[in-house]
Interface confidence: low
């Protein structure tokens, strides 16, 4: 079978890929070679760790490897007729693709001398044990397998691809997805270093609900030994997050404006490069021997140098390369810690924000603070959250429960509130009476009152009709019939302008005048509630239809 699952780790100037698939050593080498690489070398402890990392990545994805011991080809072979040399670390084996006889070795057991056939080396993984940097895979020597005969072959192999340089991963300053396509035809969305000539596809956005933007970049050699994407500034910037998303995509410092905007900056001794993201030393050595972000520092009289890592990195055993320190292991944050290249970032849970005593501390966000309340009306702050409330006459509404919607008390579930006519208003209601009746002091019942005759008046004019708006728009008072036991209106009177005597105990207004000037109103034909004899009128008294309503400052008709 062919090579299936693959994993990739890029570091320094090389990428390592791990593949599962029962191939002979020759088939595995051919597979690596087709994409411009070779079976991997393991020339130092550091390289052994890189290879172990890529194998660990593969094993996390590969469920099919059920064997307790697993073997993966590397590029160490001894040709037929060439004998063992016990005095050499590589015992007479040599690296595919050439290279010097290196001092590092990690043999599984003493090698038997055999010059009859070609011998190949694989990494022996004990899958029953966790892969630890202190327990690197042992080298196992044996026959090189048979092409086209899976049964005689081992579980997989590791390739190595060397490059003239690497680009830093693209910096995302907001939600998005980067997909790198390497020259060796691997796609990945998480590479620590991206090899020269790789392509990057950036899709910005938070998924379906966002219209995603796409950007395309190539890792190019901008100057000798300087590799760059040619992009400027963090990608997928989102003022919604400011510096809180991936440190704004900035290499070192992220400076946030009050409006969610941000800019990258650098620590003293560093300068911001043209990409507006990365920081570089102001005084690098003219031809730096240091790698992986290490800064070259001249010694006294300029005679020697030392490599120094940026904060959050430390030198590896070669003293030339920097490796990231996982500062989160020291639990420096109150809530969440995010390890970033060269540093860490403290994050607070939803409902909390940075603040309080000590670095990385979090304090409750007062969502109800002046000017930032998400609620339409009442807001109560709670630890890590908040909840909204509405004034009387309104109920919570909206998908997120932050809006308030007027309750139409005239059609409410609690049954008729008024004995006769009911007028819904914004956040409240009034009761009214049919012509010839006036509202009792309780604001609910109707009593027989003076009758005034006036010219008949129809429904409101066309421009006064409209839909009820949300709670921020004044609403017209609307008359609804309160219904009898059968649930049907008993009669529908017409309306006329009121002409009550001056000593009437209540005020009245035609329906049309109840709406604030210029605001939308809803016209409903008022009708009679067929109430009991004690509670209100049984029949209309005459043809006049002026409607009396309780004043808004009355208490009985209000909630």
């Amino acid at each position: 079978t062919g090579a299936d699952t693959e994993a990739v780790v890029c570091v320094g100037t090389a990428c390592y890929t791990a593949h599962s698939g029962k191939l002979s050593a020759a088939e595995a080498q051919n597979h690596c070679n087709q994409n411009g690489g070779n079976l991997a070398t393991v020339k130092s402890k550091e390289e052994a760790q890189h290879v172990q990392r890529v194998l660990a990545q593969l094993l996390r994805r590969e469920a099919a490897l059920t064997a307790r011991m697993s073997k993966f080809w590397i590029g160490l072979q001894r040709e037929k007729g060439k004998c063992l040399d016990p005095s050499l670390p590589l015992k007479g084996f040599s690296w595919v693709g050439g290279g010097e006889d290196t001092p590092y070795s990690n043999w599984h057991k003493e090698l038997r001398n055999s010059c009859i056939s070609k011998r190949c080396v694989s990494l022996l993984l004990d899958l029953s044990q966790p892969l630890l940097p202190s327990r690197l895979p042992k080298w196992s020597e044996g026959p090189c397998g048979s092409p086209g005969s899976p049964g005689s072959n081992i579980e997989g192999f590791v390739c190595k691809f060397s490059f003239k340089g690497m680009c830093r991963p693209l910096a995302l300053g907001g939600p998005g997805q980067v997909t790198y396509t390497t020259p060796f035809q691997t796609t990945s969305s998480s590479l620590e270093a991206v090899p020269f000539a790789s392509a990057a596809n950036v899709a910005c956005g938070e998924g379906d609900k966002d219209e995603t933007q796409s950007h395309y970049f190539l890792c190019k050699e901008k100057a000798p030994d300087v590799f760059d994407w040619g992009s400027s500034g963090p990608l997928c910037v989102s003022p919604k997050y400011g510096c809180n998303f991936n440190n704004g995509g900035c290499h070192q410092d992220c400076f946030e404006g009050g409006d969610g905007s941000f800019l990258c900056g650098c620590r003293p001794g560093f300068r911001l490069l043209d990409d507006l993201v990365t920081c570089a030393s102001r005084n690098p050595c003219s031809s730096s021997p240091c790698r992986g972000g290490a800064t070259c520092v001249l010694g006294p009289h300029g005679k020697n140098y030392t490599c120094r890592c940026p904060q959050g990195y430390q030198l590896d055993s070669s003293q030339l390369d920097c490796v990231d320190v996982d500062e989160c292991q020291d639990s420096p944050c109150a809530q969440e810690c995010v390890n970033t290249p060269g540093g860490f970032r403290c994050e607070c849970w939803v409902g909390y924000e940075p603040g309080g005593p000590g670095e990385g501390a979090c304090q409750d966000v007062d969502e109800c603070a002046l000017g930032r309340s998400p609620c339409a009306q009442g807001c109560t702050n709670t630890d890590g959250s908040f909840h909204c409330s509405c004034e009387e006459g309104y109920v919570l509404a909206g998908e997120d429960g932050t809006q308030c919607q007027d309750v139409d008390e005239c059609v409410g579930p609690g049954g008729p509130l008024c004995d006769s006519l009911c007028f819904n208003t914004q956040g409240s209601f009034h009761c009214g009476c049919l012509p010839g009746w006036v509202l009792a002091p309780n604001g609910v019942s109707c009593t027989m009152g003076p009758v005034s005759l006036g010219p008949p008046s129809g429904p409101p004019d066309e421009e006064d009709k409209g839909e009820k708006e949300g709670s921020t728009v004044p609403r017209a008072a609307t008359a609804s019939p309160t219904r009898g036991p059968e649930g049907t209106p008993k009669a529908t009177p017409t309306t006329s302008r009121p002409s009550l005597s001056s000593d009437a105990p209540i005020t009245s207004a035609p329906l049309k005048m109840l709406a604030p000037s210029g605001s939308p109103g809803v016209w409903r034909e008022p009708s009679i509630h067929h109430a009991t004899a004690a509670s209100g009128p049984q029949e209309p008294a005459g043809g006049d239809s002026s409607v009396a309503t309780q004043n808004n400052d009355g208490t009985d008709g209000q909630k």
Epitope: Q213, H215, S231, S232, G233, L235, V237, P239, F255, E256, G257, G258, D259, G260, S261, L263, G265, C266, P268, R271, L272, D274, L276
Partner: antibody, heavy 116, light 107 residues
Amino acid sequence: DVNLVESGGGLVKLGGSLKLSCAASGFTFSNYYMSWVRQSPEKRLEWVATISNNGDSTYYLDTVKGRFTISRDSAENTLYLQMSSLISEDTAVYYCTRVGTGFTYWGQGTLVTVSA
Amino acid sequence: DIVLTQSPATLSVTPGDSVSLSCRASQSINNYLHWYQQRSHESPRLLIKFASQSISDIPSRFSGSGSGTDFTLSINSIETEDFGMYFCQQSNSWPLTFGAGTKLELK
């Protein structure tokens, strides 16, 4: 309210020097990058210089590099632009701006006229 | 340097009209483009950030679109207070540059 007030403009001879000031109020000055932007008599806008919030990074338009210096005094909430070796092309209204996503706030501007 | 080309140079319109102003970049600037309005005898003010994101206190009739090299500012149903100069500006790379502007005038 955010308020930026420029001063120090005026008539200056060719090759002369001038120092512009910008008094900032209504926001935490030390939290923001600040810039100078100028507008020529032909109404063309041109970015001149930017300074980081802590003052340790500065950025200049190539044509003013070496002649202009942007600086800030966070204690005084003041931004400065020291201009020397002035040439006729430097004649413009100079605006002090607060940097955010774009130039989010602008002062009213101060006119600098370079004459022969 | 990134050159921003605005077109047209002048646009004569009547209140109530809707218009589109164009800004083209000499190379891709992602969405790092901002629009400003400058009324006569006033300082410029930010209208749209990051090509399409609205600014609080700016009327909703102003909107922006585009990415890469081509950008558009649209004004829906122009009001008399909208006449003046409109500039685009990129913040993709140093030096920060502006377009030459489009003058919106009364027909």
